[in-house]
């Protein structure tokens, strides 16, 4: 019988009596920064090389006794989860361990930094295939630890970390808060967030995805043939490190951005019970549980996109929030969201040679979020076309006028505080889908992209009566790139993409009269790339 | 005792190798900032990561570390350079009194300084 966690991450076509997906990550080296490990355990013997790196603080307490099996417990279990013979995810992956945590599981930011530096130097001295670094640890927010992770990621290393076991916002911890790191929360056999004593898995916008992290069977350091069940976001991160090793072994040229997008794409969607998370964190927390891709090849043709939420802007009148995509992702659309509904929209703007998504708070607002739709679009040439507020009563409109450019997203930004409160809705003239429409007081921004074979279409879903939420989804084979609300609805809190669905949220309907202002229309822009599909077919 | 003697010896050597009249003001530009863990029990005061500006070479990192030691010694403080970073981030890890932070932040090439803190198995 295969342990529940391995079954959960395995697509049905791999499922047999034994968990044996093709190629076990043999081209990949996984570095583990953790406690010492029992390298002669039968699960990991010959698979894990213990480096001579050790940087740990002394154990606390005068009565602490070092017991080898206890000192090795955490690291041995994780090494087993990543690459163990019987209970490992990537059975072919080779590992290297660095000791940065003492026998009590405690380390320092500085020791971790020196460990990361050691990995970088090893990589320079002896370049090998793809590298995955597993960081099953967490401390308070650290600018320097996040910076080191960023540098290592930009050197082509995939870093995977535990979200933390503090039942708190993962953005308050490092390395979990580093945007370049793949941050993993923990779920259980019922796909529920893991509770650990009075605490549990961290959550929030800094978590990329969840993975099995409760009642995980793996190597026990009690003896060379022992197994044990352990739980935590470390175990969840180890699953993702194993999945990453499998993916990179199948496609060694994958970049970090491509790997992250694939991890998100192949995850199980909307299976986590969000009621476990604090209410204000539910919208920010990805409802994704990691899984192996159904086949190791052939995913390249798809247009991959993900949603990136900014930090909260704070409540001051001129406060803004900025959401950014990874260096090799394209920002295809930008939206905003405010729980109070008081916001002044959003716009795409250039910053350091890259487009970013900026949302603006309004007077009396509790703050806003910027939401970026970040996509992998090779050879893309994207620009933003802006129309200033119009004089005409029909409202402001802007379209993509350059030859071969298609509309991927619409944003609108306004200076007045109460836009649309007493204004009739503005409807898009039919037959003109390649344009963005907005209030006459708003400036409208169209994201226009040219990429080989890129085609997009607009899909709308309008509800005449007030609704707290209106959604519109892209059909199979199309990817959601843009999500916005049709103007004229004063009570709209904002719009954001969840997987391939555009969600437009409104104020509690009980506070809104059922007038024409109750009408809410969600507008999705769905795209696909014929070029990527053709390239994939040619490869096959 | 042995350890203290070692520190002292290191300081004397650092002092001898530095010329007098060191500039105390940072290079023109932004002021370096200090960061520490928001969770008090996790703080490790007395050990600091001094992060230097992005393009700083290893030789400059070593020079800046020695300069800090020399200036600290003039004020009667012992410091110990625990590690010099290069490869990922330029900088160094130093064991010193928190009283020296103001001085360290004024050193040339310094981008920011972070107090060391604990990390935990999850």
């Amino acid at each position: 019988s295969i342990p529940w966690n391995l079954e959960r991450i395995t697509p049905p076509r791999y499922r047999a009596d034994e968990y044996q997906p093709p190629d076990g990550g043999s081209l990949v080296e996984v570095y583990l920064l953790d406690t010492s490990i029992q390298s002669d355990h039968r699960e990991i013997e010959g698979r894990v090389m213990v480096t001579d790196f050790e940087n740990v603080p002394e154990e606390d307490g005068t009565r602490f006794h070092r017991q080898a099996s206890k000192c090795d417990s955490h690291g041995t279990h994780l090494a087993g989860v990543v690459s163990g013979r019987d209970a490992g995810v990537a059975k072919g992956a080779s590992m290297r361990s660095l000791r940065v945590l003492n026998c009590q599981g405690k380390g320092t930011v500085s020791g971790t930094l020196i460990g990361l530096e050691f990995i970088r130097k090893s990589q320079l001295v002896q370049p090998v295939g793809p590298l995955v670094v597993l960081l099953p640890l967490a401390g308070g927010y650290s600018r320097v630890l996040n910076a080191a992770c960023q540098r290592l990621a930009r050197a082509g290393v995939v870093l995977v970390t535990a979200a933390g076991n503090f039942r708190d916002d993962a953005c308050l911890y490092s390395p979990a808060s580093a945007p370049e790191v793949i941050t993993v929360g923990a779920t259980n056999a019922q796909d529920q967030p893991v509770t650990l004593g009075t605490l549990g898995t961290n959550f929030g916008r800094c978590v990329d995805l969840f993975a099995p992290g409760e009642d995980i069977i793996g190597a026990s350091s009690d003896c060379s043939t022992c197994f044990v069940s352990q739980s935590g976001t470390s175990q969840a991160a180890a699953h993702v490190a194993g999945i990453a090793a499998m993916m990179l072994s199948a496609e060694p040229e994958l970049t970090l951005a491509e790997l992250r997008q694939r991890l998100i794409h192949f995850s199980a969607k909307d299976v986590i019970n969000e009621a476990w998370f604090p209410e204000d964190q539910r919208v920010l927390t990805p409802n994704l549980v990691a899984a192996l891709p159904p086949s190791t090849h052939g995913a390249g043709w798809q247009l991959f996109c993900r949603t990136v939420w900014s930090a909260h802007s704070g409540p001051t009148r001129m406060a803004t929030a900025v959401a950014r995509c990874a260096p090799d992702e394209e920002l295809l659309s930008c939206s905003s969201f405010s729980r109070s509904g008081k916001r002044r929209g959003e716009r795409m703007e250039a910053q350091g040679g890259k487009l970013v998504c900026r949302a603006h708070n309004a007077f009396g607002g509790e703050g806003v979020y910027a939401i970026a739709r970040c996509c992998l679009l090779p050879q893309a040439n994207c620009s933003v076309h802006t129309a200033p507020p119009a004089e005409a009563s029909m409202g402001t409109r802007v379209h993509c006028h350059q030859q071969g450019h298609v509309l991927t997203g619409c944003s609108s930004h306004w200076e007045v505080e109460d836009l649309g409160t007493h204004k009739p809705p503005v409807l898009r003239p039919r037959g003109q889908p390649n344009q963005c429409v907005g209030h006459r007081e708003a400036s409208i921004h169209a994201s226009c992209c040219h990429a080989p074979g890129l085609e997009c279409k607009v899909k709308e879903h309008g509800i005449p009566a007030p609704q707290e939420q209106v959604t519109v989804a892209c059909e199979e084979g199309w990817t959601l790139t843009g999500c916005s609300a049709l103007p004229g609805t004063s009570h709209v809190l904002g719009a954001y993409a969840v997987d391939n669905t555009c969600v437009v949220r409104s104020r509690d309907v009980s506070t809104t009269g059922s007038t024409s202002e109750g009408a809410v229309t969600a507008v999705a822009i769905c795209c696909r790339s014929r070029h990527l599909a053709q390239a994939s077919q040619e490869l096959q | 005792q042995e350890d203290e003697d070692g520190d002292y010896e290191e300081l004397v050597l650092a002092l001898r190798s530095e010329e007098d009249g060191l500039a105390e003001a940072p290079e023109h530009g932004t002021t370096a900032t200090f960061h520490r863990c928001a969770k008090d029990p996790w703080r490790l005061p007395g050990t600091y990561v001094v992060v230097l500006k992005e393009e700083t070479h290893l030789s400059q990192s070593e020079r800046t570390a020695r300069r800090l030691q020399a200036q600290a010694a003039r004020r009667g403080y012992l410091t110990k350079i625990l590690h010099v970073f290069h490869g990922l981030l330029p900088g160094f890890l130093v064991k010193m009194s928190g009283d020296l932070l103001e001085l360290a932040l004024k050193l040339p090439h310094v981008d920011y300084i972070e107090e060391d803190s604990s990390v935990f198995a999850q």
């Epitope: 019988s1 342990p3 606390d60 206890k70 417990s73 955490h74 019987d86 209970a87 009590q104 599981g105 405690k106 076991n165 650990l196 004593g197 605490l199 409760e214 009642d215 995980i216 069977i217 026990s220 009690d222 003896c223 043939t225 022992c226 197994f227 044990v228 069940s229 352990q230 739980s231 935590g232 | 935990f120 198995a121 999850q122």
Partner: antibody, heavy 130, light 107 residues
Framework: EVQLVESGGGLVQPGGSLRLSCAAS????????MSWVRQAPGKGLEWVAN????????YYVDSVKGRFTISRDIAKNSLYLQMNSLRAEDTAVYYC???????????????????????WGQGTTVTVSS | DIQMTQSPSTLSASVGDRVTITCRAS??????LAWYQQKPGKAPKLLIY???SLESGVPSRFSGSGSGTEFTLTISSLQPDDFATYYC?????????FGQGTKLEIK
């Protein structure tokens, strides 16, 4: 599916001995604590003993201490209960059960999170009578 | 040793009824309590762990609550398959005790 199969029960005279065995399947056996639970005819359940994954820790109900010994063989995926100095009141159906639980680290030490006995054998009958 | 006392010892009810079984610990056991169902001639089956967590595969009509010394098992709408004996079990530093059982029979 994890299965537990008990054997070794039978009729024995007071003061006699019996060795019960419980055969398990898969690595999931060696990953958890294991227990023996008994049920006297027409009575309720009574926990008898349990043993850690590696056999390094064992606990017993007071009434069997010094008479019963729990052990396990990881290589054979088996659990045992050696019963000596048997008494009439030891007459019961004996079940082996898996104690599902997990360890998590917090504040520098491991904590144990217990779920309960989630897999049980079909039971083996022990009758102590002269 | 911690004693577990279940009440009632026997409970008569009809299909569709909502029934509650109580378990009291002689000292605080936090939330370390499990509930089992046993049918004649069969091994017990785990229903609830950690006082209120539903074991995988168990129907949602079963629920548990309580902490400290007072615990309850509730069956929201009795089904014919639910007539059995129910046991609570406490876990305290690796040694366990069961309640004496509650027999749920058809009225």
């Amino acid at each position: 599916e994890v299965q537990l199969v008990e054997s070794g029960g039978g009729l024995v005279q007071p003061g006699g001995s019996l060795r019960l065995s419980c055969a398990a399947s898969g690595i999931t056996f060696s990953s958890y604590w294991m227990s023996w639970v008994r049920q006297a005819p027409g009575k309720g359940l009574e926990w008898v003993a349990n043993i850690k994954q590696d056999g390094s820790e064992k606990y017993y109900v007071d009434s069997v201490k010094g008479r019963f010994t729990i052990s396990r063989d990881i290589a054979k995926n088996s659990l045992y209960l050696q019963m000596n100095s048997l008494r009439a009141e030891d007459t019961a159906v004996y079940y082996c059960a898996r104690d599902r639980g997990t360890y998590y680290i917090a504040d520098g030490s491991y904590n144990y999170y217990y779920y309960g006995m989630d897999v049980w054998g079909q039971g083996t009958t022990v009758t102590v009578s002269s | 040793d911690i004693q577990m006392t279940q009440s009632p010892s026997t409970l008569s009810a009809s299909v569709g009824d909502r029934v509650t079984i109580t378990c009291r610990a002689s000292q605080s056991i936090s939330s370390w309590l499990a509930w089992y169902q046993q049918k004649p001639g069969k091994a017990p089956k785990l229903l609830i762990y950690k006082a209120s967590s539903l074991e995988s595969g168990v129907p949602s009509r079963f629920s548990g609550s309580g902490s400290g010394t007072e615990f309850t098992l509730t069956i929201s709408s009795l089904q014919p398959d639910d007539f059995a004996t129910y046991y609570c079990q406490q876990y305290n530093s690796y040694s366990y005790t069961f309640g004496q059982g509650t027999k749920l029979e058809i009225k």
